[in-house]
């Protein structure tokens, strides 16, 4: 029963991680511009995500512009989008597989098969976590590298936004949840040990006693 509890905990953590990956992908705060600029007097903050860039003004008004043309997007941004989306889709599959394989559900009756299905779900969650971790870490690395790169001007230097932190948290939850699901080892098959049955015949005093029969040797032709 403790194993079922661990399974459920793993599933909940991985599910929360999957939700986090969706939130991270949707958030427009992946990169925050640390230098607003001389001519943008009203701007408080400028930030961009995978799908749009936004300007938050001192009035409280937020104006966002969706990246409309795929052709104008850098290959890095397109790859980041792709990995995040594939990670989310993989998470969907993992959720369905886990639901089928968990001990607390009755979709499959065979315990060995259920355990194997849960392990598959765990592996899928681990892969989903990696697919989230790679683009998030790559984006963070680019931001840090640019920050110290003297060629990148002040106006283009960026800071890490909430989207990246949510992405890391999501990946961590999926990794943890996936690992817990992978710990669902198939139940060991019961081994029936053959009990030795010793048959002892009534003792006979004659020389034939060693044969375990009630006959004397002389009775054999």
């Amino acid at each position: 029963m403790a194993n079922a509890g661990l399974q459920l905990l793993g599933f909940i953590l991985a599910f929360l991680g999957w939700i986090g990956a969706i939130v991270s992908t949707a958030l427009p705060q992946w990169r925050i511009y640390s230098y607003a600029g001389d001519n943008i007097v009203t701007a408080q903050a400028m930030y961009e995500g995978l799908w749009m860039s936004c300007v938050s003004q001192s009035t409280g008004q937020i104006q966002c512009k969706v990246f409309d043309s795929l052709l104008n997007l850098s290959s890095t941004l397109q790859a980041t989008r792709a990995l995040m989306v594939v990670g989310i889709l993989l998470g969907v599959i993992a959720i369905f597989v886990a639901t089928v394989g968990m001990k607390c559900t009755n979709c499959v009756q065979d315990d060995t098969a259920k355990a194997k299905i849960t392990i598959v779900a765990g592996v899928l969650f681990l892969l989903a976590a990696l697919l989230t971790l790679v683009p998030v870490s790559w984006s963070a690395n680019t931001i840090i590298r640019d920050f110290y790169n003297p060629v990148v001007p002040e106006a283009q230097k960026r800071e890490m936004g909430a989207g990246l932190y949510v992405g890391w948290a999501a990946a961590a939850l999926q990794l943890l949840g996936g690992a817990l699901l992978c710990c669902s080892c198939p139940p060991r098959e019961k081994k029936y040990t053959a009990t030795k049955v010793v048959y002892s015949a009534p003792r006979s005093t004659g020389p034939g006693a060693s044969l375990g029969t009630g006959y004397d040797r002389k009775d054999y032709v």
């Epitope: 110290y148 060629v151 990148v152 001007p153 002040e154 283009q156």
Partner: antibody, heavy 118, light 108 residues
Framework: EVQLLESGGGLVQPGGSLRLSCAAS????????MSWVRQAPGKGLEWVSI????????SHAQRFQGRFTISRDNSKNTLYLQMNSLRAEDTAVYYC???????????WGQGTLVTVSS | QSVLTQPPSASGTPGQRVTISCSGS????????VSWYQQLPGTAPKLLIY???NKHFGVPDRFSGSKSGTSASLAISGLRSEDEADYYC?????????FGGGTKLTVL
């Protein structure tokens, strides 16, 4: 007044070394990335190297990698360019320039002439 | 061989409008800011335009900058004799600063 003043140029033999200096005044030197740009006689502008405000990070044009070294001393408000293994084609006016917020060279020095000849 | 391509020369008569082009790539002009410089004979270059279209302090309104895709241009309207100089465009990519070869503007 915002000003950059280069010094250290002159005549040097091929294979020789030279160290250029650039004294900054009128602005917070430690807040800006600084750069060296050169101009050969009758030719266009050519970027040489750049250094970030703290001096921790530098970048050089590919052709100067290994021969030229940019450095700065923020306590002295001075930028340096150490040039080694000089060649005849390094003959040029070397300008020190401030790298502005938008990736433009907003302040330039008057330049110092470096002549590499035997 | 310069990374950014500029016409070697341009000319115009006083009062005329002249445009100088600067062609680059996605990694420099296409993605980053463009600056324009004026270099009068025997002097250091002077910044005219930064952030692609913003005029530097003291630069007359006759000068304007624009960008489209991987190309940028500097327009000078109401040309004057004192505008006769060399003009350079400049941008950067991830690791290097790049200049155009320069355009010699002659006021006829």
């Amino acid at each position: 007044e915002v000003q950059l003043l280069e010094s250290g140029g002159g005549l040097v033999q091929p294979g020789g070394s030279l160290r250029l200096s650039c004294a900054a005044s009128g602005f917070t030197f430690s807040s800006y990335a600084m750069s060296w740009v050169r101009q050969a006689p009758g030719k266009g502008l050519e970027w040489v190297s750049i250094i970030n405000p703290s001096g921790a990070s530098t970048s050089h044009a590919q052709r100067f990698q290994g021969r030229f070294t940019i450095s700065r001393d923020n306590s002295k408000n001075t930028l340096y360019l150490q040039m080694n293994s000089l060649r005849a084609e390094d003959t040029a006016v070397y300008y020190c320039a401030r790298y502005g917020r938008y990736g433009s060279f907003d302040i330039w020095g008057q330049g110092t002439l470096v002549t590499v000849s035997s | 061989q310069s990374v950014l391509t500029q016409p070697p020369s341009a000319s115009g008569t006083p009062g005329q409008r002249v445009t100088i082009s600067c062609s680059g790539s996605t990694s420099n002009i296409g993605r980053n800011y463009v600056s324009w410089y004026q270099q009068l004979p025997g002097t250091a270059p002077k910044l005219l335009i930064y952030d692609t279209s913003n005029k530097h302090f003291g630069v007359p309104d006759r000068f304007s900058g624009s960008k489209s895709g991987t190309s940028a241009s500097l327009a000078i309207s109401g040309l004057r004799s004192e505008d006769e100089a060399d003009y350079y465009c400049q941008s950067y990519d991830s690791s290097k600063v790049v200049f155009g070869g320069g355009t010699k503007l002659t006021v006829l």
